[in-house]
């Protein structure tokens, strides 16, 4: 077990031409917060895949209001570290996603609005217990500077936090087969710890964190009898080929959950919901106090000062169970209305509303731009009781939530060239054409085919779009 720590140093415009517009304005003050998502291994998974190593959200930064005419400076940051606790071994190689979010503090209908400003990702090697590693990542015109490290929580030590150290019981030597713990020579290596939940009756381990099964048992935690596993498996061979003429006993038959635990079947095994005071795969671990740290996923343990009194875990948002061991898929209840996208930020549930809707659950139907429904710096344009978004460079879609190459749609007609300028796409028209998107031919006598040429529009005029 241990903690991954992330320190954000600065978030602001990157070097080179094209400073980004400030994300805040006098009309729309805002503040930043950050989200980090960690995955084990050198994962190339999509940003939306689960943060298997954990995730964390920062506090909100100070409120910031742009000074008119000034380029975006480094923006004020939240205080403190982002900490992602990990329960098992530190994998050594990991992938990260760091998102910078903007919370708009204007007069929002239904509270503040959130939008993603920048997302950076990377794959790194990192040993636990090492020094802070510094990094710079760029997302578009933004630059994020940060440091990170992984540290083990006592009693774990080592580059993977798999070796456990405990104070020596005798002053001179460690127990049989156990070595002193470098660099803590006054402590000793503790006995091997198998994967959490590994069956104490049917499983064993030779390496920290593994779970190997005794003959006759299978499953990741050695809890499934071999005689029934192939028949239970929905993808397993048919009973005719295995000799399973009748279904084997179900995983909950005979209730494997001790101490009053209730059993529920899972696709490959079973799961026990334990009463307070007990935990473990079969609720077999008892006499637990808060000192044993029975609450997982950042749950707060109260009571249970001695083995005879029960403890209670107060779970953080997103987790449930007597030991906060179960992740709640709060988005499965589809709380966001009107096609809103549900976002579980860990500490809270957010709805990313479709254009035209606002409110904490996207319950407010907007007929115009009152709710500022355009994301990522897009500008809302009213018209006819509806609205549309004119998106900033690099974003597209109805509400500017899609990251896009502004030139990908070939917006410049008649062979015109599209350039991805930092201030918006620019069309350079081929000879003989003019207009915002090179859509109008220029007549040989110099007159344009515009029905009514706007004042100041010249043949060959480029136009830019924000």
């Amino acid at each position: 077990a241990g903690v991954f720590e992330l320190q954000i140093h600065s978030f602001g415009p990157g070097p080179g031409p094209g400073a980004p517009r400030s994300p805040c304005s006098a009309r729309l003050p805002c503040r930043l917060f950050f989200r980090v998502c960690l995955k084990p291994g050198l994962s190339e998974e999509a940003a939306e895949s689960p943060c298997a190593l954990g995730a964390a959200l920062s506090a909100r930064g100070p409120v910031y209001t742009e000074q008119p005419g000034a380029p975006a400076p480094d923006l004020p940051l939240p205080d403190g570290l982002l900490q992602v606790p990990f329960r098992d071994a530190w994998p050594g190689t990991f992938s990260f996603i760091i998102e910078t979010w903007r919370e708009e503090l204007g007069d929002q209908i239904g509270g503040p609005a959130w939008s993603l400003l920048a997302r950076v990702a990377g794959r790194r090697r990192l040993a636990a217990g090492g020094p802070w590693a510094r990094d710079i990542q760029r997302a578009g015109a933004w630059e994020l500077r940060f440091s990170y490290r992984a540290r083990c929580e006592p009693p774990a030590v080592g580059t993977a936090c798999t070796r456990l150290c405990r104070p020596r019981s005798a002053p001179s030597r460690c127990g049989p087969g156990l070595r002193p713990c470098a660099p803590l020579e006054d402590e000793c290596e503790a006995p091997l710890v198998c994967r959490a939940g590994c069956s104490p009756e049917h499983g064993f381990c030779e390496q920290p964190g593994e779970c190997r099964c005794l003959e006759g048992w299978t499953g990741p935690l050695c809890t499934v009898p071999v005689s029934t596993s192939s028949c239970l498996s929905p993808r397993g061979p048919s009973s005719a080929t295995t000799g399973c003429l009748v279904p084997g006993p179900g995983p909950c038959d005979g209730n494997p959950c001790a101490n009053g635990g209730s059993c529920s079947e899972t696709p490959r095994s079973f799961e026990c919901t334990c009463p307070r005071g007990f935990y473990g795969l079969r609720c077999e671990v008892s006499g637990v106090t808060c000192a044993d740290g029975p609450c997982f996923n950042g749950g707060l343990c109260v009571g249970g000062a001695d083995p005879d009194s029960a403890y209670i875990c107060h779970c953080p948002p997103g987790f449930q169970g007597s030991n906060c061991e179960k992740r709640v898929d709060r988005c499965s209840l589809q709380p966001c209305r009107n096609g809103g996208l549900c976002l579980d930020l860990g500490h809270a549930l957010r709805c990313r509303c479709r254009a035209g809707f606002a409110g904490p659950r996207c319950e407010h139907d907007l007929d115009d731009c009152a709710g500022r429904a355009c994301a990522n710096g897009g500008t809302c344009v009213e018209g006819g009781g509806a609205h549309r978004c004119s998106c900033a460079l690099g974003f597209g879609g109805r509400d500017c939530r899609e990251r896009a190459d502004p030139c990908a749609a070939r917006p410049c007609a008649h062979g015109g060239r599209c350039y991805a300028h930092f201030s918006g796409l620019v069309c350079a028209c081929a000879p003989g054409y003019m207009g915002a998107r090179c859509e109008f031919p220029v007549h040989p006598d110099g007159a344009s085919a515009l029905p009514a040429a706007p004042p100041g529009l010249r043949p060959g005029d480029p136009q830019r779009y924000l």
Partner: antibody, heavy 119, light 110 residues
Framework: QVTLRESGPALVKPTQTLTLTCTFS?????????MGWVRQAPGQGLEWMGT????????DYASWAKGRVTISVDTSKNQFSLKLSSVTAADTAVYYC???????????WGQGTLVTVSS | DIQLTQSPSFLSASVGDRVTITCQST????????LSWYQQKPGQPPKLLIY???NLEIGVPSRFSGSGSGTDFTLTINSLEAEDAATYYC??????????FGGGTKVEIK
Amino acid sequence: QVTLRESGPALVKPTQTLTLTCTFSGFSLSSSYDMGWVRQAPGQGLEWMGTIYTGDYSTDYASWAKGRVTISVDTSKNQFSLKLSSVTAADTAVYYCARHTGYGYFGLWGQGTLVTVSS
Amino acid sequence: DIQLTQSPSFLSASVGDRVTITCQSTESVYGSDWLSWYQQKPGQPPKLLIYQASNLEIGVPSRFSGSGSGTDFTLTINSLEAEDAATYYCQGYYSGYSYAFGGGTKVEIK
């Protein structure tokens, strides 16, 4: 960091073909730019040679360069290159690669590489 | 061929002076304002000062300004400083996707 860096031979013999490479980093050609070559003879002014447009890989060359200059892109290596055929002493210059992202200006330049044509 | 003519080709001025460089094109630049100005010091690549005739590039001191449209353009240095000693070039972009540079103006500090 967004950078351009030219590389190639410092010395070329007359009548040979000069090949220069510009390696870029910090951006990708999935967006649309003009990637260009500009040269500067010793003590002289800047001279545009040609550009390649990354939207469709079409090329445009200065009138004097047509037939002598070829510009191409290797997206897999993040490089674009210049070939100048039948070089003479008059082609001795510092060669720059540069990027245009709209409004007609080169906003990003390499440091330049000096090429001398001599036998 | 399109020609961009800069004048003067050389000028010597004192610190604090107001300096003006002109650039004339034989053809109108694209969109009437796709003209830029660069500063170049020995051994360095050109540095963008002004784009689209009058837009000051980020990080460039405000004593530099540009004006003009069509075929006639001007670069002004309001109060010359010692570090402004350099060669200045105008550059145009033209219909048909071509570029051209002016011949340059060398600015020397007296």
